[in-house]
């Protein structure tokens, strides 16, 4: 009875319904379930789809933009528990922009163990006010349920029996009022006596055994649970896994061979990101915690004496780090038995991620090669690297090799970092931002001075774009339009004018005037500069009639402040001296233009002859908004409006004080036409500072969530299925 089907890995089902059938025999999803981005599905596609075996999801359930899905009552009729072991932005249940969903219908959902609920922007979604979430989860105050049809008092939510004048469903108190609780017009919400806590109860209200979670078929019996509060072992719910079993994924007990199989499957596979499971504190976990190292004979984590040595043997003697994911595979390594090739072209929060994953490496037995890592500004993420042995060398006998790193400005802070290179030479070519002084300092510190030959460190292609020595460039002319900025600056010529290769113009959006040239610790951060290469002007022999170099910046955002600076690009002179010049950072704002469209219009009728319309300001005001234009036209009536018997519910008309689900500061500021009564005597009170602050925080929180959602769900296409059963890692 307990979990009658299979344990399935986390799933991401998108674009079409094909992969939904993989859920067919699943009782437990060990991981998350995401169903999203299905734009061609219709209600009839879901008619015969049902997964009655699914009882529990260990992480979270996310539904996003699945067209045609009107209810979950047939899809997941027996889903009882969402554990929330890992959450989606603090949420265990997310229903977002489900355009056709009319009701949740998860009528057997009894417990969300951790995390809360976010139900937002579902235009057709009703039966929300009839759910008592406090019976399902603890942190009800963290729920975020807004911008659904339910908000507008347009829902005729009728619980079972109401139409016949009977009360069939449990009623619980919210805000001092008893309200009937149901999921749909035919399914009550199941409520248990408070003594039962989250263990669940039978239909008669007899509590399930306290090791149960959510529901059971008989009281007092840990073998008759629908799901387990703590751990599942051989058809029984138990408080803790007894020897010889180990806790796994926070919900089940597994034996040693299960954990060992996972360890070896990962070890023997070439799959990135799988975990070589180990045993620690009676748990089978993905890796030893910090301060512990694995005993390979029994997979047990044992405490390290001093800092944990973790020798990582590289397949084929070398490893290329080309992403955060590949860096994660070396997390915790202190000694690299082999050579590392760093080839990082992009990524988010790179410096922090690289330090978290590579920052414990103290020693590399082979060579270190930094090649075409356009994203790197510094190598300081190798925080503890003290020794490169050079036991194997790159072709040409190099133990440290830096080639074509367009943004590398610093190796390490040599005042705080020691590095010894036992064997091999240094190679530096085409590192345009890396000053020669930095390279010479490395020669001294690492003990490699005198080993290099003439062409190992290129004099002309290292630091050639760096402002190692500067004169000040001054802007002489600035003109703006809504999407362009025209700049000119004073001419600059080095002693040999042929050494001037051109100028580099750096710019970026800067809401505040606090930008520095080296903002962002990698070259891919959101605050990194856009760079334009500009040819030098024609040189005139008459100093008074010199052409002022300049540039027309195009495609800019209206009404936006930009930080701008310019610097020279010069070649090396024979004396190894770099001439160069650089301007201060200036701030220039583009002009205003037409705004983008207003957002989220919401209409409601407050009488038979009036429609109230509210909206949010446009995401891009492109200036100060002074007024809005409203257009309307009559449309054909929706027959569904006539079929619903509104009298059953006794719906109230919205009162004059009606306000839409959002009332942001902006919508107040930009939408001054308040709805006054006929006498015109009353106006709304000004908002308090705390109200305004709260609304700003709410608006910011909404944006943050949407950004997070989009970043997580929109991924480049790749041909792979969900996490394989052989890899039960956190999905």
């Amino acid at each position: 009875h307990l979990y009658p089907g299979e344990v399935c890995p986390g799933m991401d089902i998108r674009n079409n319904l094909t992969r939904l059938h993989e859920l067919e025999n699943c009782s437990v999803i060990e991981g998350h379930l995401q169903i999203l981005l299905m734009f061609k599905t219709r209600p009839e596609d879901f008619r015969d789809l049902s997964f009655p075996k699914l009882i529990m999801i260990t992480d979270y359930l996310l539904l996003f933009r699945v067209y045609g899905l009107e209810s979950l009552k047939d899809l997941f009729p027996n889903l009882t528990v969402i554990r929330g072991s890992r959450l989606f932005f603090n949420y265990a249940l997310v229903i977002f922009e489900m355009v056709h969903l009319k009701e949740l219908g998860l009528y057997n959902l009894m417990n969300i163990t951790r995390g809360s609920v976010r139900i937002e922007k579902n235009n057709e979604l009703c039966y929300l006010a009839t759910i008592d979430w406090s019976r399902i989860l603890d942190s009800v105050e963290d729920n975020y349920i807004v911008l659904n049809k339910d908000d507008n008092e347009e829902c005729g939510d009728i619980c079972p029996g109401t139409a016949k004048g009977k009360t069939n469903c449990p009623a619980t108190v919210i805000n001092g009022q008893f309200v009937e609780r149901c999921w749909t017009h035919s399914h009550c919400q199941k409520v248990c006596p408070t003594i039962c806590k989250s263990h669940g109860c039978t239909a008669e209200g007899l509590c399930c055994h306290s090791e149960c979670l959510g529901n059971c078929s008989q009281p007092d019996d840990p073998t008759k649970c629908v799901a387990c509060r703590n751990f599942y072992l051989d058809g029984r719910c138990v408080e803790t896994c007894p020897p010889p079993y180990y806790h796994f994924q926070d919900w089940r007990c597994v034996n040693f061979s299960f954990c060992q199989d996972l360890h070896h499957k990962c070890k023997n596979s070439r799959r990135q990101g799988c975990h070589q499971y180990v045993i620690h504190n009676n748990k089978c976990i993905p890796e030893c915690p910090s301060g512990y190292t694995m005993n390979s004979s029994n997979l047990l984590c044992t405490p390290c004496l001093g800092p944990c040595p973790k020798v990582c043997h590289l397949l084929e003697g070398e490893k290329t780090i080309d992403s955060v994911t590949s860096a994660q595979e070396l997390r915790g390594c202190t000694v690299i038995n082999g050579s590392l090739i760093i080839n990082i072209r992009g990524g988010n929060n790179l410096a922090a991620e690289l330090e978290a994953n590579l920052g414990l490496i103290e020693e590399i037995s082979g060579y270190l090669k930094i090649r075409r890592s356009y994203a790197l500004v510094s190598l300081s993420f190798f925080r503890k690297l003290r020794l490169i042995r050079g036991e194997t060398l790159e072709i040409g006998n190099y133990s440290f090799y830096a080639l074509d790193n367009q943004n590398l400005r610093q190796l390490w802070d040599w005042s705080k970092h020691n590095l010894t290179i036992t064997q091999g030479k240094l190679f530096f070519h085409y590192n345009p931002k890396l000053c020669l002084s930095e390279i010479h300092k490395m020669e001294e510190v690492s003990g490699t001075k005198g080993r290099q030959e003439r062409n190992d460190i290129a004099l002309k292609t290292n630091g050639d774009q760096a402002s190692c020595e500067n004169e000040l460039l001054k802007f002489s002319y600035i003109r703006t339009s809504f999407d362009k900025i025209l700049l000119r600056w004073e001419p600059y010529w080095p002693p040999d004018f042929r050494d001037l290769l051109g100028f580099m113009l750096f710019y970026k959006e800067a809401p505040y005037q606090n930008v520095t040239e080296f903002d962002g610790q990698d070259a891919c951060g959101s605050n990194s500069w856009t760079v334009v290469d500009i040819d030098p002007p024609l040189r005139s022999n008459d100093p008074k009639s010199q052409n002022h170099p300049g540039w027309l910046m195009r495609g800019l955002k209206p009404w936006t402040q930009y930080a701008i600076f310019v610097k020279t690009l010069v070649t090396f002179s024979d004396e190894r001296r770099t001439y160069g010049a650089k301007s201060d950072i200036i701030y220039v704002q583009t002009d205003a233009t037409n705004p983008s469209v207003p957002l989220d219009p919401i209409s409601v009728s407050n009488s038979s002859s009036q429609i109230i319309l509210k909206w949010k300001p446009p995401s891009d005001p492109n200036g100060n908004i002074t007024h809005y234009l409203v257009f309307w036209e009559r449309q054909a009536e929706d027959s569904e409006l006539f079929e619903l018997d509104y009298c059953l519910k006794g719906l109230k008309l919205p009162s004059r004080t009606w306000s839409p689900p959002f009332e942001s500061e902006d919508s107040q500021k930009h939408n001054q036409s308040e709805y006054e009564d006929s006498a015109g005597e009353c106006c709304s009170c000004p908002k308090t500072d705390s109200q305004i602050l709260k609304e700003l925080e709410e608006s910011s929180f909404r944006k943050t969530f949407e950004d997070y959602l989009h970043n997580v769900v929109f991924v480049p296409r790749k041909t792979s299925s969900g996490t394989g059963a052989e890899d039960p890692r956190p999905s």
């Epitope: 449990p170 009623a171 619980t172 008893f178 409520v191 006596p193 408070t194 003594i195 039962c196 806590k197 109860c201 039978t202 239909a203 008669e204 209200g205 007899l206 509590c207 399930c208 055994h209 306290s210 009281p219 007092d220 019996d221 408080e239």
Partner: antibody
Framework: EVQLVESGGGVVQPGGSLRLSCAAS????????MHWVRQAPGKGLEWVSL????????YYADSVKGRFTISRDNSKNSLYLQMNSLRAEDTALYYC???????????WGQGTLVTVSS | EIVLTQSPGTLSLSPGERATLSCRAS???????LAWYQQKPGQAPRLLIY???SRATGVPDRFSGSGYGTDFSLTISRLELEDFAVYYC?????????FGQGTRLEIK
């Protein structure tokens, strides 16, 4: 056959203490919650306290909260009620009872009489 | 706490008659979380009904229960001699369990 045998009742002065015991047999004691219910002479039933199967959760009637403590020893199949600061109105026949589904009572002992009198 | 009021206090009927006992809660119970017990003189109580309408094991089918919210009833369709006793209702909706004061069913 389920058997519940209460002991420890007697006469005690107001403000005094008493400890009731209940010996259980005929069922797996540590699978079930247990109750104490009392009945004043010639009066109705009054629920006193409840303890979960493992002793992790306890509940009390407002009338005894802070004065009475329910406990259990699963290794001895025994249920206890420690009664302090006794009052005249605590005089009653005290029943030890086995719960079904925690909240209802399917088996009762025969009761032990507690008399609080000066 | 929820107070349960039983009525009538005493009900006098003859064997073979139908008995209806009432139990009213001071606050609405969130569901049918109510039980009925029978107690004969000098004996411990006996469970009859739970969940407002489910009979306990071994209880004859002449006993039935119903109700929802605040109003509940116990019906004995044809009284037999052994049915004359005191009947108590008990609510278990809240963590403060309470009993009604009882209804005495006596032979007329």
């Amino acid at each position: 056959e389920v058997q519940l045998v209460e002991s420890g009742g007697g006469v005690v002065q107001p403000g005094g203490s008493l400890r009731l015991s209940c010996a259980a047999s005929g069922f797996t004691f540590d699978d079930y919650a247990m109750h104490w219910v009392r009945q004043a002479p010639g009066k109705g039933l009054e629920w006193v306290s409840l303890i979960s199967w493992d002793g992790g959760s306890t509940y009390y009637a407002d009338s005894v909260k802070g004065r009475f403590t329910i406990s259990r020893d699963n290794s001895k199949n025994s249920l206890y009620l420690q009664m302090n600061s006794l009052r005249a109105e605590d005089t009653a026949l005290y029943y030890c009872a086995k719960a079904r589904g925690v909240v209802i009572i399917d088996y009762w002992g025969q009761g032990t009489l507690v008399t609080v009198s000066s | 706490e929820i107070v349960l009021t039983q009525s009538p206090g005493t009900l006098s009927l003859s064997p073979g008659e139908r008995a209806t006992l009432s139990c009213r809660a001071s606050q609405s119970l969130s569901s049918s979380f109510l039980a009925w017990y029978q107690q004969k003189p000098g004996q411990a109580p006996r469970l009859l009904i739970y969940g407002a309408g489910s009979r306990a094991t071994g209880v004859p089918d002449r006993f039935s229960g119903s109700g929802y919210g605040t109003d509940f009833s116990l019906t004995i369709s044809r009284l037999e001699l052994e049915d004359f006793a005191v009947y108590y209702c008990q609510q278990y909706d809240r963590s403060q369990i309470t009993f009604g004061q009882g209804t005495r069913l006596e032979i007329k």
